[in-house]
């Protein structure tokens, strides 16, 4: 039985040209996390964090995706096209797969504040 829950940074906004941290946290389960995959709104993979082997940033994103902090992901040099859904997929044993959702809005405004709060989707 899958008992875990994913907490995420929920809905966040950030300035065009700036950076943003995407964070997820898996709790309430003793399952072993084998891999965490970060995916973009069009379902393309941004990065994989393997428990033993570390990070693999996908070639198309190497210039502006940085691993961490922790199991999170930092998106840099944001463009308006980065607006959309992001997913963290936790692959665990023996539970299976947990998935969290974050919505990022990239704002043109120079006064846009980076707002983030942890919430359970």
């Amino acid at each position: 039985m899958m008992t875990g829950t994913i907490e995420t940074t929920g809905n966040i906004s950030a300035k065009k040209g700036g950076s943003v941290i995407l964070q997820c946290h898996l709790s309430s389960t003793m399952a072993q996390v084998t891999q965490v995959n970060w995916e973009q709104h069009d379902h393309s993979l941004l990065a994989i964090r393997n428990a033993e082997l570390g990070w693999h940033i996908y070639p198309a994103f190497k210039d502006r995706v940085a691993p961490g902090p922790g199991l999170g992901l930092t998106l840099q040099s944001l463009t308006m096209n980065d607006t959309g859904e992001y997913f963290c997929t936790y692959h665990t044993y023996p539970d299976g797969t947990y998935r969290g959702r974050i919505f990022l809005e990239v704002l043109e405004s120079s006064v846009a504040e980076h707002s983030a709060r942890f919430q359970i989707p």
């Epitope: 084998t34 570390g54 996908y58």
Partner: antibody, heavy 120, light 107 residues
Framework: EVQLQESGPGLVKPSETLSLTCAVS????????WNWIRQPPGKKLEYIGY???????YYNPSLKSRVTISRDTSKNQFSLKLSSVTAADTAVYYC??????????????WGQGTTVTVSS | DIVMTQSPDSLAVSLGERATINCKAS??????VAWYQQKPGQSPKLMIY???YRYTGVPDRFSGSGSGTDFTLTISSLQAEDVAVYYC?????????FGGGTKVEIK
């Protein structure tokens, strides 16, 4: 260039333990991931598991109860032990390197493979 | 486990013609797919990673495409040295799994 060479007995009796070693040259096993993959005759390649640069291991859950992968950094080699073998473990066994940072789970260097037959 | 199913099992193509190999994943693996070439009597060689990126030294007649569940390896102009068995592999989730292989021969 990275080179990998498997060694070990080609014939193992049922219920015994299969033991193979992979000698690595041209690269240190304290970097990247070192893997065992097998191919039974007429079947798919099957991932057995790996030992990471730090010595942590991952085993395919289907084999986990029978598999041990270890390493000897002083000899720059790593080993596979598979216990309680049956005829279904007859296969070509490959050792391989995986550079996860650059290529994800794609295996970029393979040994030439060694055939292991389980038979009495 | 994710099952990778390749088609066709074998393929005969004339020299200089296009060869197309398909791989279908039992669930969405995004672009976490690699392709390997195994020539007779040799070990597999990495050709494509991340679904569409050629590995170092791989000729540009080889290309990979696809995302989600459907992937393709294309040899744009088959050469004699391309005769081999080709395998796909997913690494979206562990255990990483392989397809059954497609044998490419010359017609």
């Amino acid at each position: 260039e990275v080179q990998l060479q498997e060694s070990g007995p080609g014939l193992v009796k049922p219920s015994e333990t299969l033991s193979l070693t992979c000698a690595v040259s041209g690269y240190s096993i304290t970097s990247d991931s070192w893997n065992w993959i097998r191919q039974p005759p007429g079947k798919k390649l099957e991932y057995i598991g790996y030992i990471s640069y730090s010595g942590n291991t991952y085993y395919n859950p289907s084999l986990k109860s029978r598999v041990t992968i270890s390493r000897d950094t002083s000899k720059n080699q790593f080993s596979l032990k598979l216990s309680s073998v049956t005829a279904a473990d007859t296969a070509v066994y490959y050792c391989a390197r995986l550079d996860f940072s650059n290529y994800g789970g794609a295996v970029d260097y393979w040994g030439q493979g060694t055939t292991v037959t389980v038979s009495s | 486990d994710i099952v990778m199913t390749q088609s066709p099992d074998s393929l005969a193509v004339s020299l200089g013609e296009r060869a197309t190999i398909n791989c279908k994943a039992s669930q969405n693996v995004r672009t976490a797919v690699a392709w390997y070439q195994q020539k007779p009597g040799q070990s597999p060689k990495l050709m494509i990673y991340s679904a569409s990126y050629r590995y170092t030294g791989v000729p540009d007649r080889f290309s990979g495409s696809g995302s989600g569940t459907d992937f393709t390896l294309t040899i744009s102009s088959l050469q004699a040295e391309d005769v081999a068995v080709y395998y796909c592999q997913q690494y979206y989730t562990t255990p990483w799994t392989f397809g059954g292989g497609t044998k490419v021969e010359i017609k």
